[in-house]
């Protein structure tokens, strides 16, 4: 039975040209995290594998940095980066847990972080 929950940074905003950290945290389970995939809509951004380490998709290499931890740092943000991001935790023996983050990239300098929330 899958008992874990994914806590994410939730709805967040950031300034154009700036950077942002996307973070997810898996709790309430003793399952082993074998891999975390980061996706933006229908694009694979990066993968962190327990054995192989990080793989950043070549088309994002200039603007995506691994970490901190299992998170992902997006740099040189543009308005086109606005949208949904997903952290997909592959675990053993539980299976797959998915967290969602919505990022809004703002033209103005008023960019506030949203509240944290949980996805079961």
């Amino acid at each position: 039975m899958m008992t874990g929950t994914i806590e994410t940074t939730g709805n967040i905003s950031a300034e154009k040209g700036g950077s942002i950290i996307l973070q997810c945290h898996l709790s309430s389970t003793t399952a082993q995290v074998t891999q975390v995939n980061w996706e933006q809509q229908d694009q694979l951004l990066a993968i962190c594998n327990a054995d192989l380490g990080w793989h950043i998709s070549p088309s994002f290499k200039d603007r995506v940095a691994p970490g901190p931890g299992l998170g992902l740092t997006l740099q040189s943000l543009t308005v086109n980066d606005t949208g949904e991001y997903f952290c997909i935790y592959h675990t053993y023996p539980d299976g797959t847990y998915t967290g969602r983050i919505f990022l809004e990239v703002l033209e103005s300098s008023v960019a506030e972080h949203g509240a944290r929330f949980q996805i079961p």
């Epitope: 082993q32 074998t34 891999q35 229908d42 694979l44 327990a50 054995d51 793989h55 088309s59 053993y92």
Partner: antibody, heavy 118, light 107 residues
Framework: EVQLLESGGGLVQPGGSLRLSCAAS????????MSWVRQAPGKGLEWVAS????????YYADSVKGRFTISRDNSKNTLYLQMNSLRAEDTAVYYC???????????WGQGTLVTVSS | DIQMTQSPSSLSASVGDRVTITCRAS??????LNWYQQKPGKAPKLLIY???SLQSGVPSRFSGSGSGTDFTLTISSLQPEDFATYYC?????????FGGGTKVEIK
């Protein structure tokens, strides 16, 4: 240089068994998921089975489930496919392949031919 | 199971031609789509992974695009060594499934 070398193929009667091996070199075998893929004569590619690196979890195509067993010996850098209750439709070239991040198959062996016939 | 449908099943083209092969998944597979090239009697060779990432050592005339259910492999200028069969493959979920293949022949 990454190398995968399959062996163990041959002619076997229906209902018989074979054990295929895939010797890996040139990379840290224990860190990678591995797969077997087969190709019947003149046909397309068909995935057979996969095994994960860190957990040893195994996955099978419905067509071989209960008959084939994928395993690995990380100390010997070798992948195996135990094939039991073989059928004529299992006749194919069997390839082993490395599966980084369980997303793509980046290196393939040269293949070994399994022929099931009476 | 996710079904992968490739088209066309075969095509004839000349050296220098631009060639496009399409692959459609029966459900959304995000960008978990790979392309392989296979020549007679040889093992498949990875060309493109994760829909659009060019595998190391593969010529830049090969490119991939698409996401969700519809994907494309493009050869910008066909070379003599490109005459082969091409397969798409989804890795979104097991069982891993391949398209039926597209044979690229000399016109």
């Amino acid at each position: 240089e990454v190398q995968l070398l399959e062996s163990g193929g041959g002619l076997v009667q229906p209902g018989g068994s074979l054990r295929l091996s895939c010797a890996a070199s040139g990379f840290t075998f224990s860190s990678y998921a591995m797969s077997w893929v087969r190709q019947a004569p003149g046909k397309g590619l068909e995935w057979v089975a996969s095994i994960k690196s860190n957990t040893g979890s195994t996955y099978y195509a419905d067509s071989v489930k209960g008959r084939f067993t994928i395993s690995r010996d990380n100390s010997k850098n070798t992948l195996y496919l135990q094939m039991n209750s073989l059928r004529a439709e299992d006749t194919a070239v069997y390839y082993c392949a490395r599966e980084p991040y369980s997303v793509w198959l980046d290196y393939w062996g040269q293949g070994t031919l399994v022929t099931v016939s009476s | 199971d996710i079904q992968m449908t490739q088209s066309p099943s075969s095509l004839s083209a000349s050296v220098g031609d631009r060639v496009t092969i399409t692959c459609r998944a029966s459900q959304s597979i995000s960008s978990y789509l790979n392309w392989y090239q296979q020549k007679p009697g040889k093992a498949p060779k990875l060309l493109i992974y994760a829909a659009s990432s060019l595998q190391s050592g593969v010529p830049s005339r090969f490119s991939g695009s698409g996401s969700g259910t519809d994907f494309t492999l493009t050869i910008s200028s066909l070379q003599p060594e490109d005459f082969a069969t091409y397969y798409c493959q989804q890795s979104y979920s097991t069982p891993l499934t391949f398209g039926g293949g597209t044979k690229v022949e000399i016109k």
